[in-house]
């Protein structure tokens, strides 16, 4: 167990032309805060995937108001470290995402508004207990300077925080088989604490809390002898019987070697033979360098001159992931307003607006009927960002250009009969109804103002009394 610590030194405009506009203004003061997300290994997951090693959010920085005309300076930062505790072993290689967020403090309805200013990501190798590592990352025109380290929480020590240390019981030396704990020479390495109940004779562990069985034993605590039988393919002869052992779960069962590594058993454990480009106990660490061209979709590879230093892919707009392998679905944020259709063209977003709306994000409501003619005597009706034509009798369609069967839309209410006529249509009303479309009952049934049941209810012509 231990803690990953991140110290932000500065966030401001990067070098070179095109300095970014200050994110805050006199009208809209704001303050910054940061979010860090950690994932084990050289993760190739998208930014949205879980922060399996942990995540942390900084405090809010001081409120900042831009001075008119002044260039955007380094922005005031929150106090303190960002700390991400980790419960298990420190993986040695990790991926990080650091996001800079702006909290606008203007007169927001419903509280402050948050927006993401910049996001940087990278992959690094880092031993726990080492010194602070300094880094500079750029996101667009912004530059973030920071330091980070991983430190173990006592009693854990070591580069992975898996060795445990205890104060010496005797002043002169540590117990049998246990070394002094560098750099804490006055403490001794403690034996690994295996899973509670793990058999001391037949079980062992390489990580705290696990229980791995020696050959011939099985069960969660290695207390169950592997049963004997006249097996066909024995793992080895049994000293207890003349039969042979049914194979227990071997250390290579299920192939613990990742990325195509091959597993071979050793007397106490297993060994992975890794393919080119991978290393580590389980071949989980990528040794890929920029020379291998790991960045897809036009991503720019930086660093990684040798297998011991990680490379970073700087992705072009529209792509993300450690290797720029994932297309960003920028339309999922629904940037097009008023029902506009979002098109992600890779290099840019485009909104195809519904009739009656315009602008890059369909944010402008047009006069729906301006310049739109309805043919054949139809009249234009504005409504909901789309013009519609109220067509004269005998015509239909969006612009009243289609000659319609005037009776096709059942224009006569309450069972009236429709007759197509050279001038349009005529409704012959059922007895008791009148109006151009038979929509008015002459005498609604029932004497009371609010009948218990709607009178004269016909299918398709329900009545509602309010």
């Amino acid at each position: 167990a231990g803690v990953f610590e991140l110290q932000i030194h500065s966030f401001g405009p990067g070098p070179g032309p095109g300095a970014p506009r200050s994110p805050c203004s006199a009208r809209l003061p704001c303050r910054l805060f940061f979010r860090v997300c950690l994932k084990p290994g050289l993760s190739e997951e998208a930014a949205e995937s879980p922060c399996a090693l942990g995540a942390a959010l900084s405090a809010r920085g001081p409120v900042y108001t831009e001075q008119p005309g002044a260039p955007a300076p380094d922005l005031p930062l929150p106090d303190g470290l960002l700390q991400v505790p980790f419960r298990d072993a420190w993986p040695g290689t990790f991926s990080f995402i650091i996001e800079t967020w702006r909290e606008e403090l203007g007169d927001q309805i419903g509280g402050p508004a948050w927006s993401l200013l910049a996001r940087v990501a990278g992959r690094r190798r880092l031993a726990a207990g080492g010194p602070w590592a300094r880094d500079i990352q750029r996101a667009g025109a912004w530059e973030l300077r920071f330091s980070y380290r991983a430190r173990c929480e006592p009693p854990a020590v070591g580069t992975a925080c898996t060795r445990l240390c205890r104060p010496r019981s005797a002043p002169s030396r540590c117990g049998p088989g246990l070394r002094p704990c560098a750099p804490l020479e006055d403490e001794c390495e403690a034996p690994l604490v295996c899973r509670a109940g793990c058999s001391p004779e037949h079980g062992f562990c390489e990580q705290p809390g696990e229980c791995r069985c020696l050959e011939g034993w099985t069960g969660p605590l290695c207390t169950v002898p592997v049963s004997t039988s006249s097996c066909l393919s024995p793992r080895g002869p049994s000293s207890a019987t003349t039969g042979c052992l049914v194979p227990g779960p071997g250390p290579c069962d299920g192939n613990p070697c990742a990325n195509g590594g091959s597993c071979s058993e050793t007397p106490r454990s297993f060994e992975c033979t890794c393919p080119r480009g991978f290393y580590g106990l389980r071949c989980e660490v990528s040794g890929v360098t920029c020379a291998d061209g790991p960045c897809f979709n036009g991503g720019l590879c930086v660093g990684g001159a040798d297998p011991d230093s990680a490379y970073i892919c700087h992705c072009p707009p529209g792509f993300q992931g450690s290797n720029c392998e994932k297309r960003v679905d920028r339309c999922s944020l629904q940037p097009c307003r008023n029902g506009g259709l979002c098109l992600d063209l890779g290099h840019a977003l485009r909104c195809r607006c519904r009739a009656g709306f315009a602008g890059p994000r369909c944010e402008h409501d047009l006069d729906d009927c301006a310049g739109r003619a309805c043919a054949n005597g139809g009249t234009c009706v504005e409504g909901g960002g789309a013009h519609r034509c109220s067509c004269a009798l005998g015509f239909g369609g969006r612009d009243c250009r289609e000659r319609a069967d005037p009776c096709a839309a059942r224009p006569c209410a309450h069972g009236g009969r429709c007759y197509a006529h050279f001038s349009g249509l005529v409704c012959a009303c059922a007895p008791g109804y009148m109006g151009a479309r038979c929509e008015f009952p002459v005498h609604p049934d029932g004497a009371s103002a609010l009948p218990a049941a709607p009178p004269g209810l016909r299918p398709g012509d329900p009545q509602r009394y309010l």
């Epitope: 109220s390 209410a413 109006g435 151009a436 479309r437 008015f440 009545q463 509602r464 309010l466």
Partner: nanobody, 117 residues
């Protein structure tokens, strides 16, 4: 769902005038056929005047020339201008709407008109 609220009823002398208003919500009156009905004590409810979605109007014979039905799309309301009122016009007047898209009919709660000297 369309809601209808009538107003403008009251006591008036014979020969006097009154204007009833019906405010609609939930749909635009330009897409509704609307009408005024009345129900005198002990009698059936009867149609007085109607205005179709296309603007054409209908009146019962006894009010033709005295009553005028009109519609104001901007205010989403329908009106009944009643002139030369008679004692037999005394009734509860109801607003009615026919919605063409759903073919539902809706009624208001009514407003009382009393013509008496």
């Amino acid at each position: 769902e369309v809601q209808l609220v009538e107003s403008g009823g009251g006591l008036v002398q014979p020969g006097g005038s009154l204007t009833l208003s019906c405010a609609a919500s939930g749909s635009s009156v330009k897409f509704l056929s609307m009408a005024w009905y009345r129900q005198a004590p002990g009698k059936k409810r009867e149609l007085v005047a109607g205005i179709s979605a296309d603007g054409s109007t209908d009146y019962i014979l006894s009010v033709k020339g005295r009553f005028t039905i009109s519609r104001d799309n901007a205010k989403n309301s329908v009106y009944l201008q009643m002139n030369s009122l008679r004692a037999e016009d005394t009734a509860v007047y109801y607003c009615y709407a026919y919605e063409w898209t759903t073919r539902y009919t809706y009624w208001g709660q009514g407003t009382l008109v009393t013509v008496s000297s």
